[in-house]
Interface confidence: medium
């Protein structure tokens, strides 16, 4: 049974029963804020093998291991993420180990495991076998490995049962718990998954399979699932859906919106059944299931309830996909992340107008603002204290604003402020004054010549 579109279990642990028949959760799974410690031993969901988005656990009292709950969870696809993360385990007071011994693949996104005072068996898991970019993982504030004294199966009897891999030049046994090894496939399988008996799965399988070299025996699919088979692409007259399966036109036409929302129904575009036309396209009728190219960027007005939209991750930027006019203020605060600019450009690259102010602060992951590649007007209808409509503070790696030879940006009202951007040359800021029409608006201290560009090789600004 496919469950979804996202399951939120909070306050009452008995809600877990909602997962009873789920084999795939199409969407996210949240388990959170269960303050009364319960006996979870009677709760076991062996049918669940795949979560298509992300898994989040937060403050669930009494839960000691996830392995008992989800013994067969094999793949978290990360089709949509929680702040760049596909697995989040945060402030789980009683969790002793993760224990997801069948988890073989996190297809997209990183993991965040933080402030779990009793959590061990973290250094014994080789996350590089499960996900691609371990550098984005955030594992902080858990029980220290010294206190944990993690022992993989068989170690005490000096008959280790688990395999070894190297992490940061430390070659060690890999396991999830004191009695569960981390599964590794034979090197002969290459990138393919394998069965429990180490036979290589069909190339279209992901995570694991019940029989070797059989595309109908996969636990999860590398690409798409259709009618019992894992396929590299959806067959004719079927469409990709939610990043993992193929559906027909009738199915797509009759999907109720998860949010009840204002959407005019799902559309079929470029072989995919999706909630809205992608950027650059617009429906050819308010009832239409099909998209046609826009003349220029498609107009889309986006508004934030709170007036100010904080962009602190790829996930929060995702909410702005397709927006051309943002009614409100943009606060960009991207502290970490690799190659984040291209993701931000995907989601924010069509914004042409911001009606309020733009503030970029503590965004150490940013080298340039060129991801806002179509921004042409900051109206400054709302300004920061001190009448600033463009505010750039403490961005340790910011070197370039935009390519001013190919950029026409006006700031209709308000001043600019720049401070503590050590790699941003003052000449670049002065150039922005010229282009945006703000020259003469700034007060003396608004562009600090001492702490902007002091760690860059800038041409002398005389």
């Amino acid at each position: 049974e496919i469950c979804g579109p996202g399951i939120d279990i909070r306050n009452d642990f008995q809600q877990l029963k909602r997962l009873e028949n789920c084999t795939v959760i199409e969407g996210f799974l949240h388990i959170l804020l269960i303050s009364k410690a319960e006996d979870y031993r009677n709760y076991r969901f062996p049918k669940l093998t795949v979560i298509t988005e992300y898994l989040l656990l937060f403050r669930v009292a009494g839960l000691e291991s996830l392995g008992d709950l989800f013994p067969n969870l094999t793949v978290i696809r990360g089709w949509k993420l929680f702040y760049n993360y596909a697995l989040v385990i945060f402030e789980m007071t009683n969790l002793k180990d993760i224990g997801l011994y069948n988890l073989r693949n996190i297809t997209r996104g990183a993991i965040r495991i933080e402030k779990n005072a009793d959590l061990c068996y973290l250094s014994t898991v080789d996350w590089s076998l499960i996900l691609d970019a371990v550098s984005n993982n955030y594992i902080v504030g858990n029980k220290s490995p010294k206190e944990c004294g993690d022992m993989c199966p068989g170690t005490l009897e000096e008959k280790p049962l688990c395999e070894k891999t190297a992490i940061n030049n430390e070659y060690n046994y890999r396991c999830w718990t004191t009695n569960r090894c981390q599964k590794m496939c034979p090197s002969a399988c290459g990138k393919r998954a394998c069965t429990e008996n180490n036979e290589c799965c069909h190339p279209e399988c992901l995570g694991s399979c019940h029989a070797p070299d059989d595309d109908t025996a996969c636990v999860a699919c590398r690409h798409y699932y259709f009618s019992g088979v894992c396929v590299p692409a959806c067959p004719p007259n079927t469409y990709r859906f939610e990043g993992w399966r193929c559906v027909d036109r009738d199915f797509c036409a009759n999907i109720p919106n998860a949010d009840g929302g204002d959407s005019e129904g799902f559309v079929i575009h470029d072989g995919e059944c999706m909630q809205e036309c992608p950027s650059g396209f617009i429906r050819n009728g308010s009832q239409s299931m099909f998209c046609i190219p826009c003349e220029g960027p498609c107009p889309k007005v986006c508004e934030e309830d709170k007036k100010t939209k904080t962009i602190d991750s790829v996930n929060s930027a995702q909410m702005l996909q397709g927006c051309t006019i943002f009614k409100g203020n943009l606060l960009i605060n991207i502290r970490r992340g690799n190659n984040i600019a291209s993701e931000l450009e995907n989601f924010m690259g069509l914004i042409e107008v911001v009606t309020g102010y733009v503030k970029i602060s503590h965004s150490h992951a940013l080298v340039s603002l060129s991801f806002l590649k179509n921004l042409r007007q900051i109206l400054g209808e709302e300004q920061l204290e001190g009448n600033y409509s463009f505010y750039v503070l403490d961005n340790q790696n910011l070197q370039q604003l935009w390519d001013w030879d190919h950029r026409n940006l006006t700031i209709k009202a308000g001043k600019m402020y720049f401070a503590f951007n050590p790699k941003l040359c003052v000449s670049e800021i002065y150039r922005m004054e010229d282009v945006t029409g703000t020259k003469g608006r700034q007060s003396k201290g608004d562009i600090n010549t001492r702490n902007n560009g002091e760690r860059a090789s800038c041409e002398s600004d005389i």
């Epitope: 036409a253 009759n254 109720p256 919106n257 009840g260 929302g261 204002d262 959407s263 005019e264 129904g265 617009i282 429906r283 050819n284 009728g285 308010s286 009832q287 046609i292 826009c294 003349e295 498609c298 107009p299 889309k300 007005v301 006019i325 009614k327 107008v353 009606t355």
Partner: antibody, heavy 117, light 107 residues
Amino acid sequence: QIQLQQPGAELVKPGASVKLSCKAPGYTFTSYWMHWVKQRPGQGLEWIGETNPSNSVTNYNEKFKSKATLTVDKSSSTAYMQLSSLTSEDSAVYYCTIGRGRGFAYWGQGTLVTVSA
Amino acid sequence: DIQMNQSPSSLSASLGDTITITCRASQNINFWLSWCQQKPGNIPKLLIYKASNLHTGVPSRFSGSGSGTDFTLTISSLQPEDIATYYCLQGQSYPYTFGGGTKLEIK
């Protein structure tokens, strides 16, 4: 807040044409399909057609295809409906309205068209 | 064209009553049905969209249900300001079509 501004009334002679306007101030204009609805005095509602202000794509009710022409002027955020070869059957209130989940969420005040010699 | 059969065409009820108006489509329209209210001399006003979603600012005594071909609008605890004509509208396929309306009066 979305507002749709329509003139109150138009008096036209039989056989003539009339161009009704619907002004949608603000940024919202190109983001919504603009629909037109007819209501004869004491009668129900009839959908005439819709236009997409961003690219001028239009879809008509077959019944009104030869009667109504829908256009937009993006620069003034205004939608227009021209009604041609008017007869007494065309005397009605004409509303412009924009959608939400394929329902009509925001309505203009309507323009009363009276066809009379 | 999809026909929308609305019943009853008129209805008289007392203040505080719960009333139900039904709309039947001539073919499956999934959940693409909305309800609007038109008070005498006023413009129509959206109440419910997508069969059961309450439009912003509409009192919670209004509710909608149904899918496929049969839909209902329920008004619980009838108020004097609910005197109006109520229309259903299908948005499944072109042309959009309205029901004939239900005129609600207070006894």
